[in-house]
C-alpha cells in the first residue's frame, strides 16, 4: 500500500497528491494508479435553513498547501479541532518493537491480499478469469489539462418529491498512471469541490496488472474568486399593498453551493434593514418579497453566501414605493 498520501490544493482547479512508496513492496513497483471522483456535498446542506438563529454556517476549508516536503499534514475535518504544534516524543523500545511487528504483519498481509483476494487483472479476451470490475479507460499524462470528471447529480432539495442518489460508476472515474515518481498534479477540477482520491501501487504492467489495496485521501479545491457573485441585475416588481418582489439570478457555478442570501434594504433617511433568504425561500419565490413598506425611495443590495463564504454585494437597485391608499386599485398585482 502506498504510504502517507497527502493531498493539498494550490488553486481552484488543481490538487497536488504526494505519497511514499510501500515500505515492503511485493517485487518492484512499476507504476501507481490514481483515481479521483467528485464528492457530493452533504445532503444536510441542501435541507437546512442556515438563516435560522443559532445555526452556524457550515465551515468548509480547502486543503492548504504543504508546509514542508516531509510534514505529514492530514487533511483535517472542518469539524475537528486542530492540535497544537508539538514535537514528537522519542520512541520507547517497546514502540520500536511494535512498529517492527506491524511492518512484518503488513508485509504478510499484503502478500495474502495479492495471492488470495486480488486476482490478477486479465484483458477481456474472452478466455480465462476475467476481471469482474469494469475496465477503466486510460488517459495519458498529456491529457491532464482537460480532465472530465463524472459529476454525481445531487437533488437540489432532497426532501422534495424525488431525490436523486449520487452515483459515480467506477468506469467513469478519471484516473492517471504515474511512473517513476511519488506525486501527481490533478488538474481540470471544479472549484471548491471535495474529491476522494484513491491510490494504488502496482508491480506489474499490462496485460496483467497486480495492484495493491487502495489508500484513500480526500481534498477540496480552493475557492474561485467571484464565483459567488450575483451576476445580472436585481429586478423588482411592486404589487398592491406595497409588496415589492425582488428577483435575482443564482450564481451559476458557486463555490460548493449557495446556502443563503442576505438582502439589505433601506428607505432614504432610515437605517438599513436586513432580510435573510434561505435556499428554500429563494427556490419558492425566485427571490423574496418585502411587505408593509412605508412610502418613499428605497435602495437594495443583495449578496450570496456559499460554503466558501460571502460573495460581493450587488450594485444598489432603487425603487419608489407610493402611498398605496392614494393609488387606484387596478395596480398590477
Amino acid at each position: 500500500v502506498p504510504l502517507d498520501p497527502i493531498s493539498v490544493s494550490n488553486s481552484s482547479s488543481q490538487i497536488i497528491l504526494k505519497w511514499k512508496p510501500p515500505s515492503d513492496p511485493n517485487g518492484n513497483i512499476t507504476h501507481y494508479l490514481v483515481f479521483w471522483e467528485r464528492q457530493a456535498e452533504d445532503s444536510e446542506l441542501f435541507e437546512l435553513d442556515y438563516c435560522l438563529k443559532g445555526l452556524k454556517l457550515p465551515s468548509r476549508t480547502w486543503s492548504p498547501p504543504f508546509e514542508s516536503e516531509d510534514s505529514q499534514k492530514h487533511n483535517q475535518s472542518e469539524y475537528e479541532d486542530s492540535a497544537g504544534e508539538c514535537c514528537s516524543c522519542p520512541k520507547t523500545d517497546s514502540q520500536i518493537l511494535k512498529e517492527l511487528e506491524e511492518s512484518s504483519f503488513r508485509k504478510t498481509f499484503e502478500d495474502y491480499l495479492h495471492n488470495v483476494v486480488f486476482v490478477p487483472r486479465k484483458t477481456s479476451s474472452g478466455t480465462g478469469a476475467e476481471d469482474p470490475r469494469p475496465s477503466r479507460k486510460r488517459r495519458s499524462l498529456g491529457d491532464v489539462g482537460n480532465v472530465t470528471v463524472a459529476v454525481p447529480t445531487v437533488a437540489a432539495f432532497p426532501n422534495t418529491s424525488s431525490t436523486s442518489v449520487p452515483t459515480s460508476p467506477e468506469e467513469h472515474r478519471p484516473f492517471e498512471k504515474v511512473v517513476n515518481k511519488e506525486s501527481l498534479v490533478i488538474s481540470g477540477l471544479r472549484h471548491f469541490t471535495g474529491y476522494r482520491i484513491e491510490l494504488q501501487a502496482c508491480n506489474q504492467d499490462t496485460p496483467e496488472e497486480r495492484c495493491s489495496v487502495a489508500a484513500y485521501v480526500s481534498a477540496r479545491t480552493m475557492p474561485e474568486a467571484k464565483a459567488d457573485d450575483i451576476v445580472g441585475p436585481v429586478t423588482h416588481e411592486i404589487f398592491e399593498n406595497n409588496v415589492v418582489h425582488l428577483m435575482w439570478q443564482e450564481p451559476k457555478e458557486p463555490n460548493g453551493l449557495i446556502v443563503l442570501y442576505e438582502v439589505s434594504y433601506r428607505r432614504y433617511g432610515d437605517e438599513e434593514l436586513h432580510l435573510c433568504v434561505s435556499r428554500k425561500h429563494f427556490a419558492l419565490e425566485r427571490g423574496c418579497r418585502l411587505r408593509g413598506l412605508s412610502p418613499g425611495n428605497y435602495s437594495v443590495r443583495i449578496r450570496a453566501t456559499s460554503l466558501a463564504g460571502n460573495g460581493s454585494w450587488t450594485e444598489p437597485t432603487y425603487f419608489y414605493v407610493t402611498d398605496y391608499l392614494d393609488v387606484p386599485s387596478n395596480i398590477a398585482k
Epitope: 438563516c51 435560522l52 445555526l55 416588481e237 442576505e262 436586513h274 432580510l275 419558492l284 425566485r286 418579497r289
Partner: antibody
C-alpha cells in the same frame, strides 16, 4: 381582485384517487408559490403541500408524502393536487392559498370538500 | 416540527368588551435576520381563513385597528380592543420561521 377557486372535491372510497384543481385570477400566477392547506371537520388548519413559482420545487407534509402530488400549469393559471391512496383521515376541506414566505398565506380559496368513506 | 399552543380554546366575550388570545411556540420564532414570523388568521363561520396580522404586530390592509398583535420569542398575543359581532369565529396563530409552517389549534371567539 385576487381570486382562487377550488374544484374537484367529492366522496371517494378509501384507497381511491381524486384530483383537485384551483383556478387563479387577478394576479400574476407564475410569480407566486402556491399551497394546499386542509381542515378536517371541526378541526384546525394543516399545511399539506407547496409548489414553487415555476413548479420545479415541491414540498409535502409527512402525512401525505408519497401519496399526494402537487403540480401547476402556469399557462392555465391552475394549481392541482393529485391525491392517491386516500384514507379516512384525509377527509377535510381543502384550500389553495397564495404563498408569502414567513407571512403564510395572503389569499385563500373558498375550499372544496373531500370525503373519504366506504 | 414547531408546536403552536393556543389558549383559551373557547373565549366567550360581551360585545364591546376586550378579548385576548395567547399563542405559545415550542421554540423561539426569531429568525436569523432578527425578524419574527408569527401571523394571526381569522376564520369566520362557513368562510375560509383570512390573515389579520403578520410579523407579530403588522396589520394586513383592511383589518380594523381594534385588532393588535404583540409578543416576542415564544409568547404572543392577539388583542381585540372592543369585540364586535362580525369578530365571531376561530382565530389561529401560525409560525413561518421554521419549515414546515405550523398552526395553533385555534381559539373560538363567541358572544356571551
Amino acid at each position: 381582485e385576487v381570486q382562487l377557486v377550488e374544484t374537484g372535491g367529492g366522496v371517494v372510497q378509501p384507497g381511491r384517487s381524486l384530483r383537485l384543481s384551483c383556478a387563479a385570477s387577478g394576479f400574476t400566477f407564475s410569480s407566486y408559490a402556491m399551497h394546499w392547506v386542509r381542515q378536517a371537520p371541526g378541526k384546525g388548519l394543516e399545511w399539506v403541500a407547496v409548489i414553487s413559482y415555476s413548479g420545479s420545487n415541491k414540498y409535502y407534509a409527512d402525512s401525505v408524502k408519497g401519496r399526494f402530488t402537487i403540480s401547476r400549469d402556469n399557462s392555465k393559471n391552475t394549481l392541482y393536487l393529485q391525491m392517491n391512496s386516500l384514507r379516512a383521515e384525509d377527509t377535510a376541506v381543502y384550500y389553495c392559498a397564495r404563498h408569502e414566505w414567513g407571512f403564510g398565506f395572503d389569499y385563500w380559496g373558498q375550499g372544496t370538500t373531500v370525503t373519504v368513506s366506504s | 416540527d414547531v408546536v403552536m399552543t393556543q389558549s383559551p380554546l373557547s373565549l366567550p366575550v360581551t360585545l364591546g368588551q376586550p378579548a385576548s388570545i395567547s399563542c405559545r411556540s415550542s421554540q423561539s420564532l426569531v429568525y436569523g435576520d432578527g425578524n419574527t414570523y408569527l401571523n394571526w388568521f381569522q376564520q369566520r363561520p362557513g368562510q375560509s381563513p383570512r390573515r389579520l396580522i403578520y410579523k407579530v404586530s403588522k396589520r394586513d390592509s383592511g383589518v380594523p385597528d381594534r385588532f393588535s398583535g404583540s409578543g416576542s420569542g415564544t409568547d404572543f398575543t392577539l388583542k381585540i380592543s372592543r369585540v364586535e359581532a362580525e369578530d365571531v369565529g376561530v382565530y389561529y396563530c401560525m409560525q413561518g420561521t421554521y419549515w414546515p409552517m405550523t398552526f395553533g389549534g385555534g381559539t373560538k371567539l363567541e358572544i356571551k
